[in-house]
């Protein structure tokens, strides 16, 4: 679940069996120059960053309700 | 590597209270939540909490909410379990328990701390 | 709080044989199960993860499946040191829980 930092694909690899209670927030890169696939980096209650799969759908639940959460904020 | 201490066993007077103590190191002790679990002899295991050491964030259990108080020092990266007015119901194996940061799973585990409660 | 039903709550099996233990969610659990080995007088130890995610250092013999309420843990080619007791645990909502147990013996 390493993150990278140049400008190229971000995720060397995702997690899984990621959990959302320790996400404080989800950053959804859509495919654009640098990278051709879509990344999603969630950032950790300590801090960290954890690359997680997009396809997964627990990801993608995790995705809609952090979104949710933002637009009722 | 990770490694979880708990303090030695206690034999303690019904009504009184018990402070027992989970040293962590081989790692950054203030980014898990540790978990507490209970296992009365002969019985499963209970969930009582937890509590992040970072911003000292706690989950309890409703059934511990009066009977635990779980508190944590960074300095010393031990994390704490206070179990109050005591009675025989207590008398338990306690055990302490980091929660990985991504995925919540326990991983690692103390050695466990009994507790007997007795007059 | 979500109720975990483990089953058997004894088991006893013959050396290189196989063993499955079954553990019902009260409500659906998104697959966060885990599954823990238990000897007296130590801590638990973390087998699997996330339904089939096996801990490093697991052998594996060790194999989870399941999804929505029902979850199942299998151990194949039983080996003198997998005598214990084995504990579902739900990771979904606090309060986490876990199954009742299953002891394992050798026959």
């Known amino acids: 679940a390493s993150v990278a930092t140049e400008l190229r694909c971000q995720c060397l690899q995702t997690l899984q069996g990621i959990h959302p209670k320790n996400i404080q927030s989800v950053n959804v890169k859509s495919p654009g120059p640098h990278c051709a696939q879509t990344e999603v980096i969630a950032t950790l209650k300590n801090g960290r960053k954890a690359c997680l799969n997009p396809a997964s759908p627990i990801v993608k639940k995790i995705i809609e309700k952090m979104l949710n959460s933002d637009k009722s904020n | 590597q990770v490694q979880l201490q708990q303090s030695g066993a206690e034999l303690v007077r019904p009504g009184s209270s018990v402070k027992i103590s989970c040293k962590a190191s081989?790692?950054?002790?203030?980014?898990?939540?540790m978990n507490w679990v209970k296992q009365r002899p002969g019985q499963g295991l209970e969930w009582i909490g937890q509590?992040?050491?970072?911003?000292?964030?706690?989950n309890y259990n409703a059934k511990f909410k009066g009977k635990g108080t779980l508190t944590a020092d960074k300095s010393s990266s031990t994390a704490y379990m206070q179990l109050n007015s005591l009675t025989s119901e207590d008398s338990a194996v306690y055990f302490c328990?980091?929660?990985?940061?991504?995925?919540?799973?326990?991983?690692?585990w103390g050695q466990g701390t009994s507790v007997t409660v007795s007059s | 709080d979500i109720q975990m039903t483990q089953s058997p709550s004894s088991l006893s099996a013959s050396l290189g044989g196989k063993v499955t233990i079954t553990c019902k969610a009260s409500?659906?659990?998104?697959?966060?199960i885990a599954w823990f080995q238990h000897k007296p007088g130590k801590g638990p130890r973390l087998v699997i993860h996330?339904?089939?995610i096996l801990q490093p250092g697991i052998p594996s013999r060790f194999s989870g499946v399941g999804s929505g309420r029902d979850y199942s843990f299998s151990i194949r080619n039983l080996e003198p040191e997998d005598i214990a007791t084995y504990y579902c645990l739900q990771y979904d909502n606090l309060p986490w829980t876990f199954g009742g147990g299953t002891k394992l013996e050798i026959k």
């Open positions: 081989g790692y950054a002790f203030s980014d898990y939540w």
């Open positions: 328990a980091r929660e990985r940061d991504y995925d919540v799973a326990m991983d690692y």
């Open positions: 509590i992040y050491p970072g911003d000292a964030d706690t």
């Open positions: 409500q659906d659990i998104n697959k966060y």
């Open positions: 996330y339904t089939s």
